[in-house]
């Protein structure tokens, strides 16, 4: 149990060509019961705890007090082999005929039962005195995960018998548990790369490689940290891990030098209004450093002189910005630039964009309201407001008239075409006050309303009116 013993990798049919452990019959062919194998191990399960006992348990029932002790035979203690080799080992036990109840032999590894993905065969050698049982276990192409302590269990007369362990130590090429990772670095600034590989066998020594040339003449013990004092151009780094079994090379990683971003491309106008433009763009290559923010530059395209450039800053994402506070019906040149930690990109190609026409900025002037009693209508006149080019083309007016009398309130509006500067509206209520306001309309929208003009509609023929479009509130002039 506690000492290491001879083991050679042999074929299953040669495994017991020499003397077998314990008593085995001559002239008896064994009969075998292969354990079922599955393609995959089951999910990991917690090994059950069992009370410690000796290999020769004391059976307590009176009927079996005279039974001889039963235990697994001594077997090899330690197997060392290379990864991808095949391995075979066994447990054997002699069960006298006096034992009536025996169960199959199960294989365990590090406290967990092995239920599949391995090949195990149990062979029985019966004779007059009892049966010798040999449980053969083989693993094809061992991997590191096969490392462990293996042992057999068997129930005899309801008592669990456990073999001594067989330590299986799998050695192989170094195995990386931490490989260098691609990083983006500032020019001429120091940075670190880490490489860690393990055996067995240990130790594992590390050589660093930069652009196919070794960096360190002497190997470093794993784990190794390489401090690179700085780079001026992109480089590829890898590490070599060496142990007694050979060499494993890590993936090669690109170390990129951070530069300013490339200019944005595909600057597009998604929407325009009279005073805003919604612009989108595709960011250029980030220069190996995340884009931090972008700048939208806007200048008036119509100006002959060097018009000042308006600059609007926004976050790098989303790649969208609404430029506001622009003039209506104006042409603009727009470009975008973005920056990372290194600096600003060049600006994108300039594109042309236009705002749409705006709404009028002033109300109609000189509003007068007359009551035409004979026709029972209000006659309203005004002066066309001074509309700028960017306010667009006048298409008409909106007249708002509100009628108030005791217990009655009526708010109405009319739209009239731009032809002429007068309109007539029917009287809605007598013995009331009518308040009139007028706004100009262009394709860009409706402008501001004029100051209210009040007129009192009498029950009969008495009329007050206000000729001014901008009276003090409540002011009226009599006709």
């Amino acid at each position: 149990g506690g000492t290491a013993e001879k083991w050679e990798e042999t074929e299953l049919d040669q495994l017991f060509s020499g003397p077998l452990p314990g008593r085995l019959p001559v002239n008896h062919r064994p009969f075998s019961a292969p354990h079922s194998s599955r393609d995959q191990l089951p999910p990991p399960q917690t090994g059950r705890s069992h009370p410690a006992h000796t290999a020769a348990p004391q059976v307590t029932s009176t009927a079996s007090k005279l039974l001889p002790p039963v235990a697994f035979n001594h077997t090899i203690g330690h197997i060392v082999l290379s990864e991808h080799k095949n391995v075979k080992f066994n447990c054997s036990i002699n069960i006298p005929n006096t034992y009536q109840e025996t169960a199959g032999i199960s294989w365990w590894k590090d406290g967990k039962e092995l239920l599949g993905a391995h090949h195990s065969i149990t062979q029985f050698y019966p004779d007059e005195e009892g049966v010798s049982i040999i449980a053969l276990f083989s693993i094809a192409s061992v991997q590191r995960s096969d490392n462990g302590s293996y042992f057999c269990k068997m129930k005899v007369n309801n008592r669990e018998i456990v073999s001594d362990p067989i330590y299986v130590e799998v050695q192989g090429l170094p195995y990386f548990i931490k490989q260098p990772e691609s990083v983006n670095v500032t020019r001429n600034t120091a940075f670190n790369l880490t490489c860690q590989a393990v055996g067995p066998p240990e130790p594992v020594n590390i050589f660093w490689v930069q652009n196919s040339s070794r960096v360190n003449e002497k190997p470093e013990r794993s784990p190794s940290v390489l401090t690179v004092p700085g780079l001026t151009e992109t480089a590829v780094f890898s590490c070599e891990a060496h142990n007694d079994k050979g060499l494993t090379v890590s993936k090669g990683v690109h170390i990129n030098i951070k530069v300013i971003p490339s200019p944005p491309t595909e600057v597009h106008i998604l929407n325009s209004t009279a005073h805003s433009i919604l612009v989108s763009w595709v960011p250029g290559f980030d220069g190996y450093s995340p884009l931090q923010n972008c700048s939208i530059q806007v200048k008036e395209a119509d100006r002959l002189s060097n018009g000042s450039v308006m600059v609007f800053n926004t976050s790098a994402s989303p790649h969208l910005y609404e430029i506001q506070q622009l003039q209506a019906l104006a042409n603009y040149s727009i470009a975008v630039s973005c920056r990372n930690e290194i600096g600003w990109s060049a600006v994108s190609p300039w594109i042309l964009a236009s705002t749409t026409e705006g709404a009028p900025s002033v109300a109609p002037l000189n509003i007068t309201v007359f009551l035409n009693e004979s026709n029972n209508i209000l006659d309203i006149r005004w002066t066309k407001p001074p509309i700028k080019r960017q306010d667009g083309e006048l298409v008409g007016y909106r007249i708002s008239h509100v009628w108030e009398s005791a217990g009655t309130y009526k708010e109405l509006s009319e739209e009239v075409s731009q032809n002429g500067s007068w309109a007539q509206i029917p009287v809605q209520i007598h013995n009331a006050t009518c308040t009139v306001r007028i706004a100009a309309i262009t394709k860009g929208g409706i402008g501001p309303f004029s100051e209210p003009v009040n007129i009192i509609i009498p029950e009969h023929s008495k009329v007050d009116y206000a000729p001014s479009s901008t009276p003090a509130p409540g002011n009226t002039d009599s006709m």
């Epitope: 290491a4 050679e8 090994g47 590894k109 590090d110 302590s149 130590e169």
Partner: antibody, heavy 118, light 112 residues
């Protein structure tokens, strides 16, 4: 992290017995041998014996047969060594250690000091 | 029993020097499986022994490459290429090829 935690120091009278413990954690206790090692003050190391907790099998150094008894309780992942008929020669630090896959004593307990004095 | 004779008992060294410790067995430690179960341990003052080298020449996980082991059969050597202050303590060899397992008497590495 594989670990072995031993019980605290013991002061016992000659002729008495003492039972010291070694609690394992971080690995399958029933799968690896536990060895016991004696170290007298200012002296070398002496192998006492081993136990395989999975089945209770033991092996002793002839010099410690009748002196040391090794047991294990798998439910608590604890190995024990009982020393009987103590004399001043048994005053020492006793270590438990795991026989790892590499077939070396790879992890050791911190040691238990046993002082035999009247 | 396999008797392990370790020399020297005491080894005074200067920091940065190389140290060499020998361990000789009264019988061959090579097992029939071709492995030699000779291990080296360091015991620092007030601490448990810690594994340095297993099976003659394999460094245990975390052991620095200043430590190396060599030998075969009955004669084995532990070398420390550049002694540092943290290396001070008592070094033992241990054989686990034969029962009973046996330790060397120990070599105390100390500063000159």
């Amino acid at each position: 992290q594989d670990q072995l935690q031993q019980s605290g120091p013991e002061l016992v009278k000659p002729g008495a017995s003492v039972k010291i413990s070694c609690k394992a954690s971080g690995y399958s206790f029933t799968s690896y041998y536990i060895h016991w090692v004696k170290q007298r003050p200012g002296q070398g190391l002496e192998w006492v014996g081993w136990i395989f907790p999975g089945n209770g099998n033991t092996k002793y150094n002839e010099r410690f047969k009748g002196k040391a008894t090794l047991t294990a309780d798998t439910s608590s992942s604890t190995a024990y060594m009982q020393l009987s008929s103590l004399t001043s020669e048994d005053s020492a630090v006793y270590y438990c250690a795991r026989l790892g896959l590499i077939y070396a004593l790879d992890y050791w307990g911190q040691g238990t000091s046993v002082t035999v004095s009247s | 029993d396999a008797v392990m004779t370790q020399t020297p008992l005491s080894l005074p060294v200067s920091l940065g020097d190389q140290a060499s410790i020998s361990c000789r067995s009264s019988q061959s430690l090579e097992n029939s499986n071709g492995n030699t179960y000779l291990h080296w341990y360091l015991q620092k003052p007030g601490q448990s022994p810690q594994l340095l080298i297993y099976r003659v020449s394999n460094r245990f996980s975390g052991v620095l490459d200043r430590f190396s082991g060599s030998g075969s059969g009955t004669d084995f050597t532990l070398k420390i290429s550049r002694v540092e202050a943290e290396d001070l303590g008592v070094y033992f060899c241990l054989q686990v090829t034969h029962v009973p397992f046996t330790f060397g008497s120990g070599t105390k590495l100390e500063i000159k």
